[in-house]
């Protein structure tokens, strides 16, 4: 111990320094550094000592601020107090706080203590400073946010004299029908299927599924993953800490979905899946999981029910032929809601209608997904809409297009079922959100989900 024996004379107190073998002395009045051996000289009987005071030189370490204090501190020193910067404590700010002691990393994140700071290493499906943002939502292959043009492949299998074509854009998780998956051509020796996300995104997992072709189960037993930012230069996903391509386990039957997560996650615009071993033909339905690069793009609870019925209100309600059992209430405006009455429909078709969600607390809203529905077989949807937001539910601000400085009109749906996602950038930070239908087909009809996060850093 550098302070044992005490190198400070005249009753000075020894403080170990941050560097090995270093120390400093806190000296009583009348003595000065470095070892409290120098006596402060007095100029004459009439004058005060020429000491610069207890804050000179600064006794506070690690950027602490020394403040002169008239009162006793009650422990060791008179005359000053050290105000410590974040990450340090102690009388002289000499101790580096271990921020990991309070377990700031959520969701299984691993905390590393740094000097006046900490970092969290998050599992693949979480992100953010404290791993507080979930990042494992479907990116839209199944729901249709990812369009047909965004899904391409090395080849397409053609059957029944070329009449049946198992196109790449059929590779949507849980797709139904006679032709309901992508199948690579028989002569394709190195098949792949590719998703263009249209912007760099954080991809944290993939779900795969096989299908039945001519009554026979077909599926991919194992596969590799590659990614790219330009669609030309590709990197294979590796086993962590090695240069070995990761081979992911695939399916064991034609219908059960199987999920794999990417830890660390992929950050890319393009993702390619390379089948390695297939049962019969390489046949695939799939979904990618992840979020926007910024995180904070998880469903806020319309679909899951986390947003409760009473939180969803509307300007008016439609009843099919005024039948109570065919009431298209706002609480039914939940993405992918099923049933004969499975959406909100307004009682009037005009631009004064709205669907409102009360998020209960101010929330960062970074995106929205909309969907139409059918009433008695008729396709109905909102083709475009505006957004408004409020913190008191009374005074509303319509979301503006930053460049044009006018109300932003978001592109809506073009059918009754496909998900249409719009990114809200810059995000809205508010408690109440209103969707304001601007154009529609049939009657104003909506199912929706809000994307964002409730925890702000």
């Amino acid at each position: 111990d550098i302070c044992d024996p005490n190198p400070c004379e005249n009753g000075g107190i020894c403080l170990p320094g941050l560097a090995d073998g270093s120390f400093s002395c806190e000296c009583p009045d009348g003595f000065t550094d470095p070892n409290c051996s120098s006596v402060v000289e007095v100029a004459s009987d009439e004058e005060e000592p020429t000491s610069a005071g207890p804050c000179t030189p600064n006794p506070c370490h690690n950027g602490g601020t020394c403040e002169i204090s008239e009162a006793y501190r009650g422990d060791t020193f008179i005359g000053y107090v050290c105000k410590c910067p974040r990450g340090f404590n102690g009388i002289h700010c000499q101790h580096n706080i271990n921020e990991c002691e309070v377990e700031p990393c959520k969701n299984g994140g691993i905390c590393t203590d740094l000097v006046a700071n900490y970092s969290c290493e998050c599992p693949g499906e979480f992100m953010g400073r404290n791993c507080q943002y979930k990042c494992s939502g479907p990116l839209g292959i199944e729901g249709g946010i990812i369009s047909n043009q965004q899904i391409t492949a090395s080849s397409t299998h053609r059957a029944l004299f070329g009449l049946q074509k198992w196109y790449p854009y059929y590779a949507r998780l849980n797709k139904k029908g006679l032709i309901n998956a992508w199948t690579a051509a028989e002569n394709d020796r190195w098949p792949w299927i590719q998703i263009n996300l249209q912007r760099k995104m954080r991809v944290t997992g993939v779900i795969t599924q096989g299908a039945k072709r001519i009554g026979s189960p077909e599926y991919i037993k194992s596969y590799k993953i590659a990614y790219s930012n330009d669609g030309k230069t590709w990197a294979m996903y590796k086993v962590k800490g090695t240069n070995e391509d990761m081979v992911f386990r695939g399916n064991i039957d034609n219908n059960t979905p199987y999920a794999n997560s990417f830890t660390p996650p992929i950050k890319a615009q393009y993702v390619r899946l390379y089948p390695q071993v297939c049962r019969r033909h390489c046949t695939l339905r799939m979904e990618l999981l992840g979020c926007e690069l910024s995180g904070c793009s998880e469903p806020l609870g319309m679909k899951s029910g986390h947003i409760q019925d009473y939180q969803i209100t509307a300007s008016s309600i439609f009843r099919t032929l005024n039948m109570d059992m065919f009431t298209w209430e706002p609480r039914k405006a939940r993405l992918d809601k099923q049933g004969k009455v499975n959406a909100w429909t307004s009682g009037h078709n005009d631009q004064s209608q709205w669907l409102q969600v009360d998020l209960l607390v101010p929330t960062k809203v970074t995106g929205i997904i909309t969907q139409g529905a059918k009433d008695f077989g008729h396709v109905q949807f909102v083709g475009s809409y505006k957004l408004a937001y409020s913190n008191d539910g009374e005074h509303w601000t319509v979301y503006q297009d930053e460049k044009q400085r006018k109300d932003k009109v978001f592109q809506g749906n073009f059918d009754n079922d496909t998900h249409r996602k719009n990114v809200i950038d810059p995000p809205i930070y508010a408690r109440h959100i209103r969707i304001l239908p601007w154009s529609w087909y049939g009657r104003i009809t909506l199912r929706s989900e809000l994307l964002g996060c409730t925890e702000e850093e």
Epitope: L321, N322, F376, G377
Partner: antibody, heavy 125, light 107 residues
């Protein structure tokens, strides 16, 4: 030419069955909900039953529920009304009628912009 | 169910004259009302929907008005081809219901 043509009417026994057909032409049959409307001799019109374009939803008036079944075969552009447990009060001219539906705007409602000529059903012993 | 009452049951009018038919609903049906014309041995023909909007191909002499429970069909100048039976139909509530009919005959 856009038209509807009913058939299958005639004499039915009380408690018996009849099946009416309505052949559609000149429009995309599967895009439209279809209806049966009847008119008793010397009386007004009475709506009987409706079916959605895909055939997955139906509505019927209370007086025929459990006895009459509306159905359609879009591959044949044909609407049907299966009439079971016939009663004397079912005697009427039966019309098939196409719903109003504007495919451009998607607007639709429960009134009828195209009717067939009707087929007479007489229920008598 | 909503009862639709058409009056008068018979209306005798000379060609070129105005004919006014009334339809009353037993409760409010907003503007969800249609008018049809039926000639003997023929199928009904849609004239008016939404209480006041003329169907495709319907001459301007036919006009509709009203909302709630009281509705009117007006034929401004009767032509020979307009002599027929007229029906109103509400499509606000289930079941769909028609009025009993008004016969417009030559005076």
């Amino acid at each position: 030419e856009v038209q509807l043509l009913e058939s299958g009417g005639g004499l039915g026994q009380p408690g018996g069955s009849l099946r009416l057909s309505c052949a559609a032409s000149g429009f995309t049959f599967s895009s439209y909900a279809m209806n049966w409307v009847r008119q008793a001799p010397g009386k007004g019109l009475e709506w009987v039953s409706a079916i959605s374009g895909s055939g997955d939803s139906t509505y019927s008036t209370d007086s025929v529920k459990g006895r009459f079944t509306i159905s359609r075969d879009n591959s044949k552009n044909t609407l049907y009304l299966q009439m079971n447990s016939l009663r004397a009060e079912d005697t009427a001219v039966y019309y098939c009628a196409k719903e109003y539906y504007d495919i451009l705007t998607g607007y639709w409602d429960w009134y009828f912009d195209l009717w067939g000529q009707g087929t007479l059903v007489t229920v008598s012993s | 169910e909503i009862v639709m009452t058409l009056s008068p049951a018979t209306l005798s009018v000379s060609p070129g004259e105005r004919a006014t038919l009334s339809c009353r609903a037993s409760q409010s049906i907003n503007s969800n009302l249609a008018w049809y014309q039926q000639k003997p041995g023929q199928a009904p023909r849609l004239l008016i929907y939404g209480a006041s909007t003329r169907a495709t191909g319907i001459p301007a002499r036919f006009s509709g008005s009203g909302s709630g429970t009281e509705f009117t069909l007006t034929i401004s100048s009767l032509q020979s081809e307009d002599f027929a039976v007229y029906y109103c139909q509400q499509y606000n509530n289930w079941p769909l219901t028609f009025g009993g009919g008004t016969k417009v005959e030559i005076k």
